[in-house]
Interface confidence: low
């Protein structure tokens, strides 16, 4: 349902993040990734 | 000093090949993305290629994927842009850039022209 | 692909006086992060692009405190207190929340 789709997109959302993340500097791509899978936790 | 200097410009025909370089001194090399910008005869600026600080990512601007390769040695502190199949619309200077923290591209070099025309 | 739109794409000004420059982007710059990555750029005549201001409003390291940005979401501006002869150029404003990166079209600042 709703649900499932908000979920599916907010997946698409983070892997572009992931992908932006790694192609910047290595301390913010650490630094940021924290922040981005304590979300992803936060979230379920 | 922190410092870019592009070379590998140069007048090249339609459909032919050219390999850009970029130089990098002043900083740690390998922590950072790199950038190519480009910037066509009086006019604005279009952002073309980015690749990861150990080279595992890329991304392309859809004018130039499946024709421009990028590329980087972190032994050499060098990053490399080739362009296959050119265009006349490729006709620009093209920039290489450090990718910060913050998403920023806060380094440009000087810039190297290419020139396509028969 | 977001597209960044400038107004004005001239801007004739008094030397001392201040200059505004306005950035719209096609839809929202805030990421997932609760960050917003809007730059502006200088590019002096003959010489390459400089970075400006980051994330919004952040004057990067060098660059003279009479340049500010503020904005939010869609709508960022470029502030100039007062101009000097050496601000003479374009500026651009540009976008590294979504791939592919995006500029806008840049704004002339010149001396009337």
């Known amino acids: 349902g709703g649900g499932g789709s908000k979920h599916k997109c907010f997946r698409k959302d983070l892997e572009q993040n992931e992908t932006l993340e790694s192609i910047m500097s290595t301390a913010e791509s650490e630094e940021e990734l924290k922040r981005y899978f304590y979300y992803l936790e936060g979230s379920k | 000093q922190v410092q870019l200097v592009e070379s590998g410009g140069g007048v090249v025909q339609p459909g032919r090949s050219l390999r850009l370089s970029c130089a990098a001194s002043?900083?740690?090399?390998?922590?950072?993305?790199m950038h190519w910008v480009r910037q066509a005869p009086g006019k604005g600026l279009e952002w073309v290629a980015v690749?990861?600080?150990?080279?595992?990512?890329?991304h392309f601007a859809d004018s130039v994927k499946g024709r421009f390769t990028i590329s980087r040695d972190n032994s050499k502190n060098t990053l490399n842009l080739q362009m296959n199949s050119l265009r006349a619309e490729d006709r620009a200077v093209y920039y290489c850039?450090?990718?910060?923290?913050?998403?920023?591209?806060?380094?440009w070099g000087q810039g190297t022209m290419v020139t396509v025309s028969s | 692909d977001i597209v960044m739109t400038q107004t004005p794409l001239s801007s004739p000004v008094t030397l001392g006086q201040p200059a505004s420059i306005s950035c719209r982007s096609s839809?929202?710059?805030?990421?997932?992060?609760?960050?917003?990555?809007l730059s502006w750029l200088q590019q002096r005549p003959g010489q390459p692009p400089r970075l400006l201001i980051y994330?919004?409003?952040n004057r990067f390291s060098g660059v003279p405190d009479r340049f500010s940005g503020s904005g939010a979401g869609t709508d960022f501006t470029l502030k100039i207190s007062r101009v000097e002869a050496e601000d003479v150029g374009i500026y651009f404003c540009?976008?590294?929340?979504?791939?592919?990166?995006?500029f806008g079209p840049g704004t002339k600042v010149d001396i009337k």
């Open positions: 540009m976008q590294t929340t979504q791939f592919p990166f995006t």
């Open positions: 839809q929202s710059l805030v990421r997932s992060d609760g960050n917003t990555y």
């Open positions: 994330k919004i409003s």
């Open positions: 850039a450090r990718g910060a923290s913050g998403f920023v591209l806060d380094i």
């Open positions: 690749i990861s600080y150990d080279g595992n990512n890329k």
């Open positions: 002043g900083f740690t090399f390998s922590s950072y993305g």
